[in-house]
C-alpha cells in the first residue's frame, strides 16, 4: 500500500480467483484513544473499533472511503483505491489503446516546436467518476522540472454505439533551450482513477521525436501566363521555432480532387513557393515537416484551385 | 590549405552542401544498422544516449543563433569570441558566430572519425561480417573536415590489444550513430543559418 495523496491510498493487488488479497492497517488521524468506530462509505454499519482497523482487501467491495468517528463526530478519512495486477501486468482498463504508433500506446504527445512545450492526450469510453493527475520530468534518476496543467476534457466523439472522450494536458519544460540536443527523455506519468480503480500510464520521449508543426499559413495562388501551371506560395506557421534559417522546414505540395483515389500532382520543396498544375474542382494543399529531423508532417493547409 | 569545394550553386556557402551530405550519410548508416542489427537494442528507445564530445566540445552553445542568445536556458557555458578562421566563412563578415563554432564542429567530426575508424577495424575482425561502416559516411566526414579547413593535432587511432567483444561493439556502434545523427542535425542547422546570414 502507498499514499497517492493526503488520505488517499493505493492497494496493489494480484488479481486472480481466490487471491488472498492484502492485509491493510488503517490508523485514525486523531489524538483520541478511546470510543473510536469505523465505517465504510455511506454505510452506518460499524466495521470495528479502536484507533486502528485491520482489513483484508481482496476486491472492490473492500475499497472505498473508511471513516473513523467518535460520538457522531468524524475524526478522519482514508480512501482506499485498488490497483490490479493480472498475470504480472498492471491493468489498463480506464484508457483506450490508441495503437498508434504501436500497440499499447495509451498516451500520445505532440509538440508544435522546440520550445519545450508539448501536449499529451488520451482516450476513454468512461464518462463519469473519473479523475486524472499528470506529472512530468526530464529524465528519471535526476529529474529536471516540467510543469503540467490540469487534464481537461478536450473532445467527445461517437464511435459506433460508444461515446469516446478525449482528455488532454499541456506541459512546459521549465528551462528549455530550443537548440539543445536532448540526451535524457521527457517522462510523462498519468494517474487515472475511475470510482475505486487506480491505474497509471507512462510515456517517454524526446521532444525532437514528437514534433508536428502547425500547417503552413497564408496560402496564395498566382496563375502563370499561357500555362496551366499555378505558383503557390505560403509562410512558416507562427508557432514554429525561430530563426527559420536555423529551424528550417521542408514542404510537400499536392493538388488533388475530393477523393484520395483521384490523380494528383505532388512536389516537395524547401522553399516557400512551388509551381504545380491546377485542375478544376481540385484543391492545392501544403504541409510541413522539420527539414533535418524527420518527425511528423503537419496537417494540410488547403485552398481551392479555382 | 584552402581546398576548392565543388557545389552545384557556386555562390553557396561551401559547407552547407557537405553538411547536408553528412546528415544524409549518417541517417542512411543508422537506418542500415537498425535493419541489420534488428535483434540488438539499436532503436532510439532502447539505447543509452551518450555524447562522446560531452565536456570536450561545445558545439550547441558555440553555434547558437543570435536570436537564441536572449534565452537564458541556452547560455549555460557560452563563449563570446567571434569567428575569425575557417574557409567555410569564405570572407563573409558576420558577427553571429565565433571561431569556436566552426572549430568545435571540426573537433566533433575528428572525434567521431577516430571512433568510427577504430570501431570499423573491430567490425572487420568479426567472423559474422554482419555490419561495417559505410565508406561513403567516412568520406563525407573527411570532406566536411577539409572544407572547414582547421588545422589541429591528429588524434591517434585507438588500438586495443584485447579480443574485441563484437556484441558490445555493435551496441556501441548504434549509440555512436544515434548521437552522431543528432550532432549532424545541429551541424546542418548551423550551416543553414550561416548560409542565410
Amino acid at each position: 500500500i502507498w499514499e497517492l495523496k493526503k488520505d488517499v491510498y493505493v492497494v496493489e493487488l494480484d488479481w486472480y480467483p481466490d487471491a488472498p488479497g492484502e492485509m491493510v492497517v488503517l490508523t485514525c488521524d486523531t489524538p483520541e484513544e478511546d470510543g473510536i468506530t469505523w465505517t465504510l462509505d455511506q454505510s452506518s454499519e460499524v466495521l470495528g473499533s479502536g484507533k486502528t482497523l485491520t482489513i483484508q482487501v481482496k476486491e472492490f467491495g473492500d475499497a472505498g472511503q473508511y471513516t473513523c468517528h467518535k460520538g457522531g463526530e468524524v475524526l478522519s478519512h482514508s480512501l482506499l483505491l485498488l490497483h490490479k495486477k493480472e498475470d504480472g501486468i498492471w491493468s489498463t482498463d480506464i484508457l483506450k489503446d490508441q495503437k498508434e504508433p504501436k500497440n499499447k500506446t495509451f498516451l500520445r504527445c505532440e509538440a508544435k516546436n522546440y520550445s519545450g512545450r508539448f501536449t499529451c492526450w488520451w482516450l476513454t469510453t468512461i464518462s463519469t467518476d473519473l479523475t486524472f493527475s499528470v506529472k512530468s520530468s526530464r529524465g528519471s534518476s535526476d529529474p529536471q522540472g516540467v510543469t503540467c496543467g490540469a487534464a481537461t476534457l478536450s473532445a467527445e466523439r461517437v464511435r459506433g454505439d460508444n461515446k469516446e472522450y478525449e482528455y488532454s494536458v499541456e506541459c512546459q519544460e521549465d528551462s528549455a533551450c530550443p537548440a539543445a540536443e536532448e540526451s535524457l527523455p521527457i517522462e510523462v506519468m498519468v494517474d487515472a482513477v475511475h470510482k475505486l480503480k487506480y491505474e497509471n500510464y507512462t510515456s517517454s520521449f524526446f521532444i525532437r521525436d514528437i514534433i508536428k508543426p502547425d500547417p503552413p499559413k497564408n496560402l496564395q495562388l498566382k496563375p502563370l501566363k499561357n500555362s496551366r501551371q499555378v505558383e503557390v506560395s505560403w509562410e512558416y506557421p507562427d508557432t514554429w521555432s525561430t530563426p527559420h534559417s536555423y529551424f528550417s522546414l521542408t514542404f510537400c505540395v499536392q493538388v488533388q480532387g475530393k477523393s484520395k483515389r483521384e490523380k494528383k500532382d505532388r512536389v516537395f520543396t524547401d522553399k516557400t513557393s512551388a509551381t504545380v498544375i491546377c485542375r478544376k474542382n481540385a484543391s492545392i494543399s501544403v504541409r510541413a515537416q522539420d527539414r533535418y529531423y524527420s518527425s511528423s508532417w503537419s496537417e494540410w493547409a488547403s485552398v481551392p484551385c479555382s | 590549405r584552402n581546398l576548392p569545394v565543388a557545389t552545384p550553386d557556386p555562390g553557396m556557402f561551401p559547407c552547407l552542401h557537405h553538411s547536408q551530405n553528412l546528415l544524409r550519410a549518417v541517417s542512411n548508416m543508422l537506418q542500415k544498422a537498425r535493419q541489420t542489427l534488428e535483434f540488438y537494442p539499436c532503436t532510439s528507445e532502447e539505447i543509452d544516449h551518450e555524447d562522446i564530445t560531452k565536456d570536450k566540445t561545445s558545439t550547441v552553445e558555440a553555434c547558437l543563433p543570435l536570436e537564441l542568445t536572449k534565452n537564458e536556458s541556452c547560455l549555460n557555458s557560452r563563449e563570446t569570441s567571434f569567428i575569425t578562421n575557417g574557409s567555410c566563412l569564405a570572407s563573409r563578415k558576420t558577427s553571429f558566430m565565433m571561431a569556436l563554432c566552426l572549430s568545435s564542429i571540426y573537433e566533433d567530426l575528428k572525434m567521431y572519425q577516430v571512433e568510427f575508424k577504430t570501431m570499423n577495424a573491430k567490425l572487420l575482425m568479426d567472423p559474422k561480417r554482419q555490419i561495417f561502416l559505410d565508406q561513403n559516411m567516412l568520406a563525407v566526414i573527411d570532406e566536411l573536415m577539409q572544407a572547414l579547413n582547421f588545422n589541429s593535432e591528429t588524434v591517434p587511432q585507438k588500438s586495443s590489444l584485447e579480443e574485441p567483444d563484437f556484441y558490445k561493439t555493435k551496441i556501441k556502434l548504434c549509440i555512436l550513430l544515434h548521437a552522431f545523427r543528432i550532432r549532424a542535425v545541429t551541424i546542418d542547422r548551423v550551416m543553414s543559418y550561416l548560409n542565410a546570414s
Epitope: 501551371q229 483515389r261 490523380k263 500532382d265 512536389v267 516537395f268 524547401d270 | 552545384p8 550553386d9
Partner: antibody, heavy 118, light 107 residues
C-alpha cells in the same frame, strides 16, 4: 492488370508526320495522366509531354512545342501522339506511360519504333 | 531546364556484390527524384519514387537515398537479372528530365 498497348512500327519520310496510338486497359482511362517519352537508338530517355484525358489539358516540353500534339479519346481509352515536320534525329522508340501522379511513370507501353529516313 | 548527371556511365560489377549509382541535379530538387530500370528491348520500369520510396513488387535489395542535388541508387547484392541500364528522373519542374543512364554490366 493495367496495360498500355501501342501501335506498330512506322517508317516516315523527313518533313512528314507520324501519329502513334496507345490503348489503355485496366482501370479508368481518365483516372490517369498519360505521357509520351522517346528514346533515340542507344540514347537516353526524353520526356515530350502529357495529357489529362479527363479534360484534354496538355503540357509539352519546350523542345517539342509546336511540333507535337497529344490527344485522347475517352470512348476508346486511347491516347495519341502526333509529331510533325519529322527529321532523321526523330528516329526513336516512342513510349506512352501513365500514372495517377503527374510527374513520374509507373506503367509503360511496349514502345513504338519510328524511323525517319529518305 | 534541370540537367541530371549520372555517374558512372558504365559500372562493371561482380554478381553478389553491391552497386551504387549516383545522380546529381544542376539545382536543388528536394526529393523529387525517381529511378527506373531498363533492359534491352524493353520499356523502363519504375524502381524507386521520391528518392527513397520503394515500389511493391520491386526487390528490397533496391534502395534510394538523397535529397537536394545528390542522389544514390543502391543495389545491395547484384543478381543476374539486375544487369541493365538505370535512369534517374527529376520531377521538380517541367520539362521533366532524365539522367543519361548508367549501364550496370557483368564484371
Amino acid at each position: 492488370q493495367v496495360q498500355l498497348v501501342q501501335s506498330g512500327a512506322e517508317v516516315k519520310k523527313p518533313g512528314s508526320s507520324v501519329k502513334v496510338s496507345c490503348k489503355a486497359s485496366g482501370g479508368t482511362f481518365s483516372d490517369y495522366y498519360l505521357h509520351w517519352v522517346r528514346q533515340a537508338p542507344g540514347q537516353g530517355l526524353e520526356w515530350m509531354g502529357w495529357i489529362d484525358p479527363e479534360n484534354g489539358d496538355t503540357e509539352y516540353a519546350p523542345k517539342f512545342q509546336g511540333r507535337v500534339t497529344i490527344t485522347a479519346d475517352e470512348s476508346t481509352s486511347t491516347a495519341y501522339m502526333e509529331l510533325s515536320s519529322l527529321r532523321s534525329e526523330d528516329t526513336a522508340v516512342y513510349y506512352c506511360a501513365r500514372n495517377k501522379e503527374l510527374r513520374y511513370f509507373d506503367v509503360w507501353g511496349q514502345g513504338t519504333l519510328v524511323t525517319v529516313s529518305s | 531546364d534541370i540537367v541530371m548527371t549520372q555517374s558512372p556511365l558504365s559500372l562493371p560489377v561482380t554478381p553478389g556484390e553491391p552497386a551504387s549509382i549516383s545522380c546529381r541535379a544542376s539545382q536543388s530538387i528536394s526529393i523529387n527524384l525517381h529511378w527506373y530500370q531498363q533492359k534491352p528491348g524493353q520499356a523502363p520500369r519504375l524502381l524507386i519514387y521520391f528518392a527513397s520510396q520503394s515500389i511493391s513488387g520491386v526487390p528490397s535489395r533496391f534502395s534510394g537515398s538523397g535529397s537536394g542535388t545528390d542522389f544514390t541508387l543502391t543495389i545491395s547484392s547484384l543478381q543476374p537479372e539486375d544487369f541493365a541500364t538505370y535512369y534517374c528522373q527529376q520531377s521538380n519542374s517541367f520539362p521533366l528530365t532524365f539522367g543519361q543512364g548508367t549501364k550496370v554490366e557483368i564484371k
